[in-house]
Interface confidence: medium
């Protein structure tokens, strides 16, 4: 479908691109000796970037540190030293720059303070870092300030003494609303959820914590759970892992009403050494990983129903190293329903799997056209693509970047990978898919950094090398043809590519440093591609594309989760600007229901490459129990339930029957006597 990528040869060269890019390349040399640089974008489409450089010298007793703060308001073309706005204070990099949600223009920097001080110090800005106000805190912060997603004036923070502090006026004044707090999170509607320890400490009381809620920023509280191990929020679901009465195992409970009522999730219980992890969640459903007993490095992915209660097995032997460890689970944001992850095969090698229907069925990634199977393959003609993600990066393989996709660059997925029977230790190449992961092509030889600009109109890449570099590569046809541009005569040690989040910008910043005998000097080059994409795209530059299309002759072609979507996509041959205001144009249409629109109900699973749901052998002939809103129920089922978010109508519709035996659940957690309200007086 697409040829092998070409670099500068057999490709339509863009006229005068070197002159156009040279005129739009802006260098900025940072006049300091810092060891590290962190960069944050402030707001959306504002062009404002904050750069914090830090230089630290560990001395015998204390460490001496210096920070510099720079600001750009033209997407990184020019920077101004604004260190004086923060009184030349040393900023604590472990807290990062706390940027407010949406376009609030709010920024908080946490300063280093001397040992004997009563509290910490922050610098606050609400005008996109034009001005900062110094504020001394009545506590020492343990975590970065957390903004309420609904109101950026509302902040919460945990102190080093485990106090929960809240501000209602963007950090000007603070109030401690609770002590002995282990974990706190914002929920919807400015609700705060937090766990507290009752006896000793967060660590000692793990499994005996209480889960509390306040809906009025700390005036009143409600205890919504006891015997808590931990909790999490995903989509519209609130999850808590709760210790069992009889042993040291724990189970997941789910609430969709902010903790007023709870249901026991139909997931296996886990022991002390195991863990649960919410891999992904949206308003419809959740992907949950349940760790296998023992130090296996894998577990099982389950997908939920629309209540987050009934789960079906989605993928076995899912790679997830340890609690808080590495998993390759990746949401392909450029196409609905697509996720990629890694499994651990019986011989402990690692293989990539992809699902196109939100976890209903997983398969190997199709072998890229014209590619050879590598030495991991038994059969040199049959193999698949394996994607390097977080685990490979954590293990220091030659993989500079995780897979990349953007919601507004429809269908595009870029990733490092190898072609064989399993992930290889050989130096990877970069592969691209333009149809959301159905088909792949080698995009670049060897490891690269890459980014998407102008909603997919331009892809930019830089070779990963331990030598200084001065060449940037770019493609205007989704990775088929590449042009090389020398952005500086003096090569730099490259440290990162930076482009505005959202992939709408046409600017890319190349960060790095030059090194002489004793000094390291940070430098950035910002390249603006606006003159490469000279004109705005017009109607004729777009073509219709049916997503998830695998069989054009079939009336159900493109149907995923009960509907199909036709997109208007930029033609590969069109060299024009999508522009910052580009909105993905799509035309949805509903499909008739079939087996594909139903996940396997609790106690059933779909064998590989099968459509029918089959009863799990270990449950055959057993009655199925599950807890729903505090009642124990027996479930009789024909094995199917509609996939959350599925919009199919008509066609096949297997029914499901639930008998309510109205027996109480045994979980203390659901005991209403435990749910009491308190006032903060």
């Amino acid at each position: 479908r697409r040829g092998a990528p070409a670099e500068d040869q057999d490709c339509g060269r863009l006229p005068d691109f070197i002159a156009k890019l040279t005129n739009n390349t802006h260098q900025h040399v940072f006049d300091d000796l810092s060891g590290s640089v962190s960069l944050s974008w402030v707001g959306d489409s504002t062009g404002v970037i904050l750069v914090l450089t830090t230089f630290q010298v560990p001395l015998v007793i204390v460490s001496f540190g210096q920070s510099k703060l720079y600001r750009s308001e033209d997407y990184g073309k020019n920077f101004k030293d604004i260190t004086n706005l923060i009184n030349n204070t040393f900023i604590r990099t472990e807290f990062g720059m706390a940027i407010g949600p949406e376009n609030s223009g709010k920024v908080i920097l946490t300063a280093e303070v001397s040992g004997g001080s009563r509290g910490g110090r922050v610098f606050r800005s609400s005008d996109f870092a034009k001005n900062f106000v110094q504020t001394d805190l009545p506590f020492h912060p343990l975590t970065q300030m957390m903004y309420s997603p609904q109101n950026s004036d509302y902040l919460l923070a945990l102190s080093t003494e485990n106090g929960l502090w809240v501000s209602k006026n963007f950090g000007e004044k603070w109030e401690e609303i609770h002590k002995a707090v282990c974990l706190a999170k914002w929920g919807p509607n400015n609700i705060i959820f937090f766990t507290t320890h009752v006896n000793g400490s967060c660590k000692a009381d793990l499994g005996a914590l209480e889960l509390w809620r306040t809906s009025d920023l700390g005036k009143t509280f409600k205890t919504i759970g006891v015997k808590i191990y931990s909790f999490g929020l995903g989509g519209r679901f609130l999850f808590a892992s709760v210790m069992a009465d009889k042993d040291t195992t724990r189970r997941i409970h789910v609430s969709t009403d902010q903790g007023d009522t709870w249901s026991m999730a139909q997931l296996p219980s886990v022991g002390q050494e195991q863990f649960y992890s919410i891999l992904a969640a949206n308003e419809d459903m959740v992907f949950m990983h349940v760790d296998e007993p023992g130090d296996t490095g894998f577990g099982t992915i389950f997908t939920s129903d629309d209540r987050g209660i009934v789960y079906s097995k989605s993928l076995d032997r899912h790679l997830y190293t340890t609690t808080g460890g590495e998993t390759d689970f990746t949401n392909v944001t450029s196409l609905r329903g697509v996720y990629i992850t890694s499994t651990l095969s019986e011989d402990n090698s690692i293989q990539s799997m992809i699902t196109f229907d939100q976890g209903g069925r997983w398969e190997h990634l199709r072998k890229p056209e014209n590619s050879k199977c590598d030495a991991t393959a038994k059969n040199k003609n049959e193999c698949s693509l394996h994607i390097h993600a977080s685990y490979s990066i954590s293990q220091k393989l030659n993989v500079p970047m995780a897979p990349l996709s953007e919601p507004n660059a429809v269908g595009i997925v870029i990733a490092h990978g190898s072609v064989g029977d399993a992930i290889s230790v050989m130096v990877p190449d970069v592969y691209i898919s333009d149809d959301g992961g159905y088909s792949w092509a080698k995009m670049l030889e060897g490891p690269h950094y890459y980014t998407i600009l102008d909603s997919g109109g331009i892809i930019v890449a830089i070779e990963h090398s331990n030598r200084p570099i001065n060449v940037i590569k770019f493609s205007t046809d989704e990775g088929q043809c590449w042009q090389s541009y020398v952005f500086t005569q003096e090569p730099i040690y490259f440290t990162g590519l930076a482009s505005e989040p959202g992939a709408r910008s046409m600017n890319i910043s190349i960060w790095g440093f030059t090194e002489s005998f004793i000094t390291r000097q940070w430098v950035s080059y910002t390249v603006d591609f606006k003159d490469i994409l000279e004109r705005n795209c017009e109607e004729d530059d777009y073509t219709t594309w049916l997503a998830h299309s695998t069989d054009p002759g079939d009336y159900k072609d493109g149907c995923i989760l009960g509907y199909k979507e036709q997109f208007l996509r930029l033609r590969k041959s069109s060299v024009c600007q999508n522009g910052r205001d580009y909105v993905v144009a799509k035309q949805p249409s509903v499909c008739p229901c079939s087996l594909e629109d139903f996940l396997c109900d609790f106690g059933y699973f779909r064998p590989e490459n099968a459509s029918e749901c089959v009863e799990q052998p270990e449950l055959k002939g057993h009655e199925l129990e599950f807890c729903l809103y505090g009642k124990e129920e027996h479930l009789t089922t024909n094995g199917y339930r509609k996939i959350p978010g599925d919009k199919c109508q008509g066609g096949m519709n297997p029914a499901r029957e639930v008998k309510d035996l109205k027996k109480k659940c045994t979980s203390n957690f659901l005991n209403p006597t435990k749910q009491n309200s308190k006032s903060n007086s």
């Epitope: 019986e346 090698s349 690692i350 490979s392 293990q395 399993a422 230790v425």
Partner: antibody, heavy 127, light 107 residues
């Protein structure tokens, strides 16, 4: 096809440094894989000495770590072993080998399963 | 480090008969186990990896089984070229360790 060939002196004096080189043909070291050294004292079993990844990351057997250095020279397509302060106990056949191309999961992070071996070179430590 | 113990040290078998070699790990190595064959004056050759997967070009008469701490290499019908020393190796943890070997000799 891929071939490995060990080379180096067959006789080393006690307390000196044993130096061996493994030349790789039919495959570019810089394209990946792990490259390891294993030894076998006369009439005994196999002992893993250490491995190097093409990028230069090294992994050594703790029992030998203080004396071992493994390095890679991608321009010459070879990797080398240096074992310092040798004694008679270091007398063995020394093999170089290529680690499997598969990336295995495990707590050791980089794991070696040797799929191609050199024919070995006998090194005697004696004065 | 993980200690690999092979038994028996020597196994006497007639050509055409079945040979069963054992390898025990001092702690679980999951399925991260390989078997090698070594003939006199030659380098070892990879036979089995992942406890049960045959390496490229290895005849079907060689099979591996087991997981955790107990592993077996079976040669279903010994050919004259199969008389050699067999080593097991774990590759779960550094340092990588080999068993002491089992010599399969003609009865």
């Amino acid at each position: 096809q891929v071939q490995l060939q060990e080379s180096g002196p067959g006789l080393v004096k006690p307390s000196e440094t044993l130096s061996l080189t493994c030349a790789v043909s039919g495959y570019s070291i810089s394209s990946g894989y792990y490259w390891g050294w294993i030894r076998q004292p006369p009439g005994k079993g196999l002992e893993w000495i250490g491995s190097i990844y093409h990028s230069g990351s090294t992994y050594y057997n703790p029992s030998l770590k203080s004396r071992v250095t493994i390095s890679v020279d991608t321009s010459k397509n070879q990797f080398s072993l240096k074992l310092s302060s040798v004694t008679a106990a270091d007398t063995a056949v020394y093999y170089c080998a290529r680690g499997s191309p598969r990336f295995y999961y495990g707590s050791g992070s980089y794991l070696d399963l040797f799929d191609i071996w050199g024919q070995g070179t006998m090194v005697t430590v004696s004065s | 480090e993980i200690v690999m113990t092979q038994s028996p040290a020597t196994l006497s078998v007639s050509p055409g008969e079945r040979a069963t070699l054992s390898c025990r790990a001092s702690q679980s190595v999951s399925s991260n186990l390989a078997w090698y064959q070594q003939k006199p004056g030659q380098a070892p050759r990879l036979l089995i990896y992942g406890a049960s997967t045959r390496a490229t070009g290895i005849p079907a008469r060689f099979s591996g089984s087991g997981s955790g701490t107990e592993f077996t290499l079976t040669i279903s019908s010994l050919q004259s070229e199969d008389f050699a020393v067999y080593y097991c190796q774990e590759y779960l943890n550094y340092p990588i360790t080999f068993g002491g070997g089992t010599k399969v000799e003609i009865k």
